[in-house]
C-alpha cells in the first residue's frame, strides 16, 4: 500500500460569541484538511477527531464519523468544525478579546487532528499538529493558510 497523506491547511473561519455575565468566549472554529489517497484502490475516511488547545488547556473537541471515501489517486478537501469555550481559569481572556481599543484580537491556538482511514479491513491513523492565529474579537473568514502562527508571543496572561 502507498501512503495516505493528510495535510492540515488551516483555519477557514472563526465565529465568536460571548457570555457577558460569565465572562466566557465561545469560538466555533472551522478548519480545512486535504486528504490524498496515493493508492490504486479506494479508502474510507472513517473518522476525524480534533481538539483545540489554548495555553496547554484543551478548550474544544470534535469527532466526525463515516465521513467519505476517496477514490484511487484522488484527493478530498474536508472541513470540520470544533466548538471551543474559553472560560473559568481563562476568563482573563474575555477582557482581551472584547477590548474595543484594539483592532485585531489574535490568540494562538494549537490545532490537533487525527484522521482514521480504512481499506481492506486495515485501519491507519495519521495525526497533525499546528499552531494557528484566531481572532477572538470578531467573526473572521480566512484565506487558507492566512491564520498560520509564525513566531509570536501569546497575549500576556
Amino acid at each position: 500500500p502507498r501512503s495516505i497523506d493528510v495535510k492540515y491547511i488551516g483555519v477557514k473561519s472563526a465565529y465568536v460569541s460571548y457570555d457577558v455575565q460569565k465572562r466566557t468566549i465561545y469560538l466555533n472554529i472551522t478548519n480545512t484538511l486535504n486528504i490524498t489517497n496515493n493508492n490504486y484502490y479506494s479508502v474510507e475516511v472513517e473518522n476525524i477527531t480534533a481538539q483545540v488547545q489554548f495555553a496547554k488547556t484543551v478548550i474544544g473537541k470534535a469527532r466526525l464519523n463515516n465521513i467519505t471515501h476517496i477514490g484511487p489517486l484522488d484527493m478530498k478537501q474536508i472541513d470540520y468544525t470544533v466548538p471551543t469555550v474559553i472560560a473559568e481559569e481563562m476568563s482573563y481572556m474575555y477582557d482581551f478579546c472584547t477590548l474595543i481599543s484594539i483592532k485585531v484580537h489574535n490568540i494562538v491556538l494549537m490545532m490537533q487532528v487525527t484522521v482514521t482511514t480504512t481499506y481492506f479491513g486495515h485501519s491507519e491513523q495519521i495525526s497533525q499538529e499546528r499552531y494557528q492565529y484566531v481572532d477572538c474579537g470578531r467573526n473572521t473568514t480566512y484565506q487558507l493558510g492566512q491564520s498560520e502562527y509564525l513566531n509570536v508571543l501569546q497575549p500576556q496572561q
Epitope: Y18, V20, Q21, Y26, E88
Partner: antibody, heavy 121, light 112 residues
Framework: QVQLQQSGAELAKPGASVKLSCKAS????????MHWVKQRPGQGLEWIGY????????KNNQKFKDKATLTADKSSSTAYMQLSSLTYEDSAVYYC??????????????WGTGTTVTVSS | DIVMTQAAPSVPVTPGESVSISCRSS???????????SYWFLQRPGQSPQLLIY???NLASGVPDRFSGSGSGTAFTLRISRVEAEDVGVYYC?????????FGGGTKLEIK
Amino acid sequence: QVQLQQSGAELAKPGASVKLSCKASGYTFISYWMHWVKQRPGQGLEWIGYVNPSSGYTKNNQKFKDKATLTADKSSSTAYMQLSSLTYEDSAVYYCAREGGSISDWYFDVWGTGTTVTVSS
Amino acid sequence: DIVMTQAAPSVPVTPGESVSISCRSSKSLLHSNGNTYSYWFLQRPGQSPQLLIYRMSNLASGVPDRFSGSGSGTAFTLRISRVEAEDVGVYYCMQHLEYPYTFGGGTKLEIK
C-alpha cells in the same frame, strides 16, 4: 419543582469552622452555577461567590477569599460552603441561590431556605 | 466594586396606590450588547429573597404584572401599581454585570 434545601441552624464558637449544605432537587444540578449570599441580622445582602458544579470551579468575592470555601458534590446534587476561623461578624443567615437563565441572560431565580449561623462563646 | 445605592430606607404606601422604589449604580450597567444588568428582589418578612425583575425591565416568571422595572444605565426604578398587603417586605436592587455582584441596602415597603 425546583428546590434548594439548606441545612439547619449552626451554633459555633469563635475560631471554629462550619460547613453548610444546599441540596438541589427538581433540575439538573450540574447545569447551573450555585451562588452563596450572606445576610447579617437586619442588614442587606452580600454576594460571597459561586461554584460551578460541573467543573468544580469557584470564584469568590475577594472579601470572602479566606473565609468561605465553596464545593459541590455531583453525586448528591449538593453544594457546600465551609466558613472558617469564625468571628462574631460571621453571624448571619447564609443563602444558596441558583443562577438560572441562558447566555448573557442569567439571574438568581431560585433561592434556598437559608441557614442561620450564630457565633457565640 | 460597583456600589448600588437605595436612598430611601423605607417607603410608606396605602393599599391600592402605586409606589416607586429607586436605585442608583456607581457605574453604568448598560452593556454594549444592549442589555442593562440591573435586577430587583423582594424579601418578605422571614422569607428568602425572590426575583422580581431581571435585566432592568423583564418580569420574572410568576411575578404579577403590577410590578414593572425601568431606568437608564445608572438609575433604576421598580414600580408597583395597586399595592397589596402581600407586597410588604424589603426590596433590593442588584447588579449582575461585574464581579463581585453587589446589592443595594434595601428599601422597606410599609403599609400605612
